[in-house]
């Protein structure tokens, strides 16, 4: 449900579906790249799966010398720290033999810092966003996305990895946070709650949304995820809140309609290529940005988070499908897969628009307590 204060013209108000900003329906790919000798000349390899650490499953990108890289999926397991009143109690732990990083879970033992010391870092994610305290930064220009429109073939891999549903993205999806801040999309995944319980990771003035999408990107300055982990700006995540609206979201339906096929943990299916950008809000100019971490172990810091001001609207039925279809390990439902919000510890969240200006009649004077730091530094 939307809070009464979430108005169309206020921060984080207004979904991107309906007449205002329809989410265009497209397709989604995942056979990955082409063959070469075992993969034809000049083509890319199909991603192979290997277990390594990271937020959701971070793909590994080949060095540039090996052509525009294809992705190797590494199961970067996930767990979350307790502490949020709505934190899940019983789900989404990983259980892989011989892997010390496998016993993750949301809201239970082991404590995350024991799994990865970085999880006890000072600049962690997610955080609570307080628009009134955000620093308006005019230097934050509209995000640029290129190559996010994909034909139906090759298909894309959609997987229930036990802690989220993840879509592996092919090479060539380029995103720029600004001049010289260029990234390539690797994968996207979702976080959600349970019936009547919201499950976004970030919150706004303490308000938790029904769900949240994360599109994970690797800086073009790095060839591999493991090189970028912990490096400032090495990874960037685009995040958008999902909330309930009156109509079915056709872009999301292309994924949600396939969830029954991957209800079991570790199962996967192939979905036709689609317009990945249609899963995001249409307004790329209004967003919040801060430096944080992966929200799952290894909780590596230096991640640039961009949280859209505009939300994405899904129907009640679609939100129910998302939160009530997948299963984690054992007999536990895959639900409430979000981490508790973490302290800012002095960090200032920047806004690309004057988010601190309250448009309601109550605000006589605009309040903007923090000033903008130089963007792109």
């Amino acid at each position: 449900q939307r809070l009464p204060r979430m108005q169309e013209d206020s921060p984080l108000g207004g979904g991107s579906s309906g007449e205002d900003d329809p989410l265009g329906e497209e397709d989604l790919p995942s056979e990955e790249d082409s063959p070469r000798e075992e993969d034809p000349p000049g083509e890319e390899d199909l991603p192979g799966e290997e277990d390594l650490p990271g937020e959701e499953d971070l793909p590994e990108v080949k060095p540039k010398s090996e052509e525009e890289g294809s992705l190797k999926l590494e199961d970067l397991p996930t767990v979350e720290a307790p502490g949020d009143p709505q934190e899940p109690q019983n789900n989404a732990h990983r259980d892989k033999e011989g892997d010390d990083q496998s016993h993750w879970r949301y809201g239970g033992d082991p404590p995350w810092p024991r799994v990865s010391p970085a999880c006890a870092g000072r600049f962690q994610s997610p955080v609570d966003i307080r628009p009134q305290l955000a620093a308006f930064c005019p230097a934050l220009r509209p995000l640029e996305l290129l190559g996010f429109q994909l034909p139906p073939l090759p298909e894309l891999r959609l997987r229930n990895n036990g802690h989220s549903v993840q879509l592996t993205l092919p090479p060539g999806l380029e995103m720029a946070l600004g001049p010289g801040r260029e990234y390539r999309a690797l994968q996207l995944h979702l976080h959600w709650g349970a019936a009547g319980r919201p499950g976004s990771e970030h919150t706004v003035e303490g308000h938790r949304f029904p769900a949240e999408i994360h599109v994970v990107h690797l800086s073009t300055a790095f060839a591999r995820v493991d090189e970028a982990l912990g490096r400032p700006g090495g990874l960037a995540v685009l995040a958008a809140f999902l909330e309930e609206g009156p109509e079915e979201n056709s872009a999301y339906e292309q994924l949600l309609s396939r969830l029954e096929e991957i209800a079991e943990e570790g199962s996967e299916t192939q979905v036709p290529g689609l317009d990945i950008s249609a899963l995001l809000p249409s307004d790329f100019s209004r967003y919040f940005q801060y430096e944080g971490s992966l929200t799952t172990p290894p909780c590596a810091q230096g991640v640039i988070w961009t949280v859209f001001n505009q939300t994405v609207m899904l129907s009640a039925k679609q939100l129910h499908t998302l939160s009530d279809t997948l299963w984690g390990p054992g007999d536990s439902r895959l639900q409430l897969n979000f981490r508790a919000t973490q302290p800012l510890n002095g960090r200032v969240i920047e806004a690309s628009f004057p988010a601190g200006v309250d448009s309601s009649p109550r605000a006589a004077e605009p309040v903007q307590l923090n000033s903008c730091l130089a963007a792109g530094d």
Epitope: E32, S34, P151, E155
Partner: antibody
Amino acid sequence: EVQLVQSGGGLVQPGGSLRLSCAASGFTFSSYAMSWVRQAPGKGLEWVSAISANGGTTYYADSVKGRFTISRDNSKNTLYLQMNSLRAEDTAVYYCANNGNYRGAFDIWGQGTTVTVSS
Amino acid sequence: QSVLTQPPSVSGAPGQRVTISCTGSSSNIGAGFDVHWYQQLPGTAPRLLIYGNNNRPSGVPDRFSGSKSGTSASLAITGLQAEDETDYFCQSYDSSLSAWVFGGGTKVTVL
């Protein structure tokens, strides 16, 4: 060596049927989407049909919908195109092509096989 | 009539630069779908020359380059050589037709 070797072309009367085959080698055939593309004499290229890696999804050009059927046997590394109710305008060189390229390009092509529909 | 429009022919002297245009619409190139280019020598199958608007498969000389803007794309050949005299096709995907689409082809002549 990565290659696609085609067979099955020939002369057929209008209304007749023909089955084209495309045998793949040198790469993991079952991991890639495949297509058929044709070229009428002296003309340009026209996409005909496509099939996903596992064979679960198929796509057809409007000009052949309901008459042609694409299929694959991943255990035999072979792609097929069953052509029924053939018309004179189906006369062309038919190419099988791998469209597993991540951006939708056709990166590996068969040598082509000629289909002539004439009475 | 092809969905993507190419000039029937272009020509240039050896060593010169020639460009081939490929014009589409809001349901293919303009919708954000990538453009790919193929070279077809007489009597042979097409060969992928440029994929993803501006990427060259290994083995393709760097004399060939691609670009895309709005609803059109172009292929540039610099340092034109005699062996470049052949046919070139652009290709994309069209969401309205739900089909992979090609241009009509351009014959490059080396003077």
